[in-house]
Structures are given as C-alpha cells and as structure tokens.
C-alpha cells in the first residue's frame, strides 16, 4: 500500500502547473454514491490534474460529477494556466475577470484583489487561502493590467505571458532555493511550517524547503498555513515534484520523482481544507 | 444619498430564531458586499457578517458562525440575517454596512434593536 | 484576532480647543499591500456610526477639516483641532487590515 516507485520524467516547465480550481467541488473525491447502477460519469482528479472517468452508482455523491469528458473539462480545468491568455488585439477580458470574488474554503485570510464587473475596477477582498477562483490578485497592479481597461477601452497589459495558476501572477515569483534549482510547486511548499494557534499536538508533515525533503511536525489543531499535510506521502506528492533541476541551458528539465501508486478508486486526503 | 434601514428586531426568547432586514438605495447594491455588525446595549462594536456582491460566499465571526445566516436579494436591494439559536449574549443594536472598494465598511444603517431574554 | 485598545475611555474637553485620541492594535495594521487599513468611527448620541477617516488619515466626504488621523503600525491618533459642539459622542478606531474586522472601546467625548 505504500509501495513507492521513482521514476524519471523528462517535463517542460509548464507541466504540473501549482494547482488552483476554478470551483471548489472540484477538489472532491470520485464519489459512486451508496446505489448500485454502473453508470459512466467523469470527475476531476486533483492529483492528475485531468478529467478522468470512474463508475457512478446512480445516487447521492457529490457535484464532482459530469456527464461528459467536455462538462468536466469545462467546469475544471483551465488550459490558460499553460497557454498565453488575451491579446490586446482582441479587447477581450479572460473570463474569470467575470467571476465574484470568492474567499474559498479556508480561514488564513489574506488580502488580495478581485475585478468587480460591476464598478469595473480592481477592489481588495479577503481571501481564505485556498480554493477560490482565478479572479484572485496579489496586487492592485496585477489585477488592473489583467481586468481593467485601459483609458481607450484596451486592455492595460499584453498578455504575452503565461498566467502563474497559483497565485495570477503574471511571471513566476522568485524563490530562494539553490540556484540549479526552480521551484515549480505550489507557493505553499515554501513556507514554513506553523503549528498554528490552539493547544491540540496532531501529527503533519511539511515541506522543508531547504533540505527538499517532508518533515514532521505537530500541528495545534487550526490556523496554520497551507504546508500542511496528514502524511509524508500527500506531502511529497504535493511539493516534492515541484523541486525541478534544471539542465545548465533551459531546455526540457529531467526530475526524478516518487509517485505513489494510485488504486482504481483514489483516496483522496484534504491537503487544500485545513482544520477549522 | 446612500440609505440602509433596518427591521425586524425585536424580544425573543432565547433559543429562539428571528430574521433583519436592510433596505438598501441610493446605490448600485449588487456592486458592494455587504456587512452586518451589532453593538451590545453600552458597549462597543463587534463585526458579525460580511457577503460577497452576488451573495454566493460569506464570512462570520466565530461567536455566530452556525447559527446566523446572512444573505442578499440584489433584485430587492436587501440584505438579510437570519438569527437561529439565540442566546442573552446576542442582545445588541445590529447595523448593516456597506463596504467599499477597500474592503472597509462605509455606510451605516440607523440599526435595529434584538433583545433575547426569557 | 487583533486587539484595539483606545485611550482616553472618556475625553472631557472644552469648547474650542484640541481633542486627542490614541488607539493602539496589538498587531501591526500595515497589510502586505503596503496600505494600513485603521479607521475612524463617529457615532453621536443616539445616532448609527458614521465613518470620519479611512486608512489612517483620508477624510471621508463631508468631514470638516478639523479631524485628523494619523500614525502607523500599531500606534495611531485621531486629533480634533478645535472642538465644537457637534463632535461630542463616541469615538471608535477599527482595523480592517486582518480579519475579523475588530474595534476599539471607544472613546467618549463630552463637553466640559
């Protein structure tokens, strides 16, 4: 069960962009429901970032759910995390400009900024820290020249560059870690780790960084941030592929990484909800 | 003129349920989340509820979380919080708030009074 | 979560001359933005709050020029340089830098 294989995966840099969902049921388990039909649906599957099909049981479940391989494609992923997003050229706004701000799951709020279609400007809000949607800026910066229209109706900025799923960011943030490395991994996997603020000593692991290895530590039971995780294998799954050695002149990245093997039906453990 | 104006207070047992009302104008409602704050009979200002601007999120303060509920109706301009489970402790003037742009209340109501007492 | 603490809790004054007010929050208020989120509330006798002044020091519309705000990180002051008749009530500070929002005690301002 917890037989651990490695592997060596040729990548190119956007492959395994940090994760962000367009709607939080996305992060749900494939749930068949407690009836007995065998019918062929599609759920989004967190870990392989695709949509993948698995057998419904005609009953309850949950709203990671669809009909079709387009309807789950449509609702969860979001190919602009990997391709260049508008062009001045089409005097068009990405779609998630549209979106209503949304806090998300957790409680490690944060200020960040939204596009209100409605006042048509960039307005700060208070994000949870996770989940949400892409209409979810770091900056008043970020989120005018990405949403705002310019003074003749154009778009501020052109987006010749590609969209940082994690965080909106329009080119990848720095991150202090050896130079013959990058940190493709979600931003979490760089923080330290925060026993947060009640008295409880639960078991977690984090990512360490530096040493690129998962680490225990004891967790108070809420708050906290996000480098968080119930065990050693979520927490390698979730930031050790994101540590990626670079070959001297760019090009295609070569990364030796463990991937759990995954049964039929995956059990998912919540790495994005911390306890509240 | 930016107006909000509270009802639906009133004495409650506790235990009980009870449901405010705001009705906004002078603005474009669906364009501002929205806020409900309560002041306990002498004392200070305590935050209570915020809602997005198409009311599908929601924040609570961890005294009410589970027992209010607050909600919008952007086609009526009116802002809501139902009250379930009350307790002595949740006697207070309760205000709506508009946010701003900021995410900073701006606009008060004049309030409406909830006393819950046996 | 963040705690205001204002002093004076009452600020006998007389007619005419200065008022100052000190609010001070356990935390710094300066958010990751660069924007430190403290605000001013007036809430006469018998009336809802009105807010005085945002984000340290910006005079909400209609706010005589009397009303200043000032300071940063956690130690922050409202001043009123002449103090008239219509400024006697309950001075609030709160801060919308962390969530939840929090209040200070209030301030109440009385005329001598």
């Known amino acids: 069960d917890s037989e651990e294989d490695e592997e060596h995966t040729i990548i190119t840099d956007t492959e395994l962009p940090p994760l962000k969902l367009m709607h939080s049921f996305c992060a749900f388990k494939a749930d068949d429901g407690p009836c007995k039909a065998i019918m062929k649906r599609f759920f989004f599957n967190i870990f392989t970032r695709q949509c993948e099909e698995f057998i419904y049981g005609g009953c309850e479940g949950n709203q990671n759910r669809f009909e079709s391989l387009e309807e789950c494609k449509k609702m969860c992923t979001r190919d602009n995390a990997n391709r260049i997003i508008k062009t001045t050229l089409q005097q068009e706004k990405p779609d998630f400009c549209f979106l209503e701000e949304d806090p998300g799951i957790c409680r490690g709020y944060i200020t960040r900024y939204f596009y209100n279609n409605q006042t048509k400007q960039c307005e700060r809000f208070k994000y949870g820290g996770c989940l949400g949607n892409m209409n979810n800026f770091e900056t008043l910066e970020e989120c005018k020249n990405i949403c705002e229209d310019g003074p003749n109706g154009f778009q501020v900025d052109n987006y010749g560059t590609q969209l940082n799923a994690v965080n909106n960011s329009l080119t990848p943030q720095s991150t202090k870690v050896p130079s013959l490395f990058e940190f493709h991994g979600p931003s979490w996997c760089l923080t330290p780790a925060d026993r947060g603020l009640c008295r409880a000593n639960e078991n977690r692991f984090y990512y360490n960084s530096v040493i690129g290895k998962c680490r225990p530590f004891k967790y108070s039971g809420c708050g906290g941030n996000e480098n968080n995780f119930t065990s050693k294998q979520e927490c390698l799954r979730a930031c050790k592929k994101g540590f990626i050695q670079r070959i001297s002149k760019g090009g295609l990245i070569k990364t030796k990484r463990k991937r759990k093997k995954q049964r039929v039906k995956i059990a998912y453990e919540e790495i994005f909800v911390k306890n509240m | 003129e930016v107006q909000l104006v509270e009802s639906g207070g009133g004495l409650v047992k506790p235990g009980g349920s009870l449901r405010l009302s705001c009705a906004a104008s002078?603005?474009?409602?669906?364009?501002?989340?929205m806020n409900w704050v309560r002041q306990a009979p002498g004392k200070g200002l305590e935050w209570v509820s915020t809602?997005?601007?198409?009311?599908?999120?929601?924040y609570y303060a961890d005294s009410v979380e589970g027992r209010f509920t607050i909600s919008r109706d952007n086609a009526k301009n009116s802002l809501y919080l139902q009250m379930n489970s009350l307790r002595a402790e949740d006697t207070a003037v309760y205000y709506c708030?508009?946010?701003?742009?900021?995410?900073?209340?701006?606009?008060w109501g004049q309030g409406t009074l909830v006393t819950v007492s046996s | 979560d963040v705690v205001m603490t204002q002093t004076p809790l009452s600020l006998p004054v007389t007619l005419g001359q200065p008022a100052s007010i000190s609010c001070k929050s356990s935390?710094?208020?300066?958010?990751?933005?660069?924007?430190?989120?403290l605000n001013w509330l007036q809430q006469r006798p018998g009336q809802s709050p009105k807010r005085l002044i945002y984000?340290?020091?910006k005079l909400d519309s209609g706010v005589p020029d009397r009303f200043t705000g000032s300071g940063s990180g956690t130690d922050f002051t409202l001043k009123i340089s002449r103090v008239e008749a219509e400024d006697v009530g309950v001075y609030y500070c709160?801060?919308?830098?962390?969530?939840?929002?929090?209040f200070g005690q209030g301030t109440k301002v009385e005329i001598k």
């Open positions: 984000l340290v020091s």
């Open positions: 809602i997005t601007t198409r009311g599908s999120y929601t």
């Open positions: 002078g603005f474009t409602f669906h364009s501002y989340a």
């Open positions: 708030a508009r946010q701003d742009g900021n995410f900073l209340m701006d606009y």
């Open positions: 709160w801060q919308g830098t962390h969530f939840p929002f929090t």
């Open positions: 935390q710094s208020l300066l958010d990751v933005d660069g924007k430190t989120y």
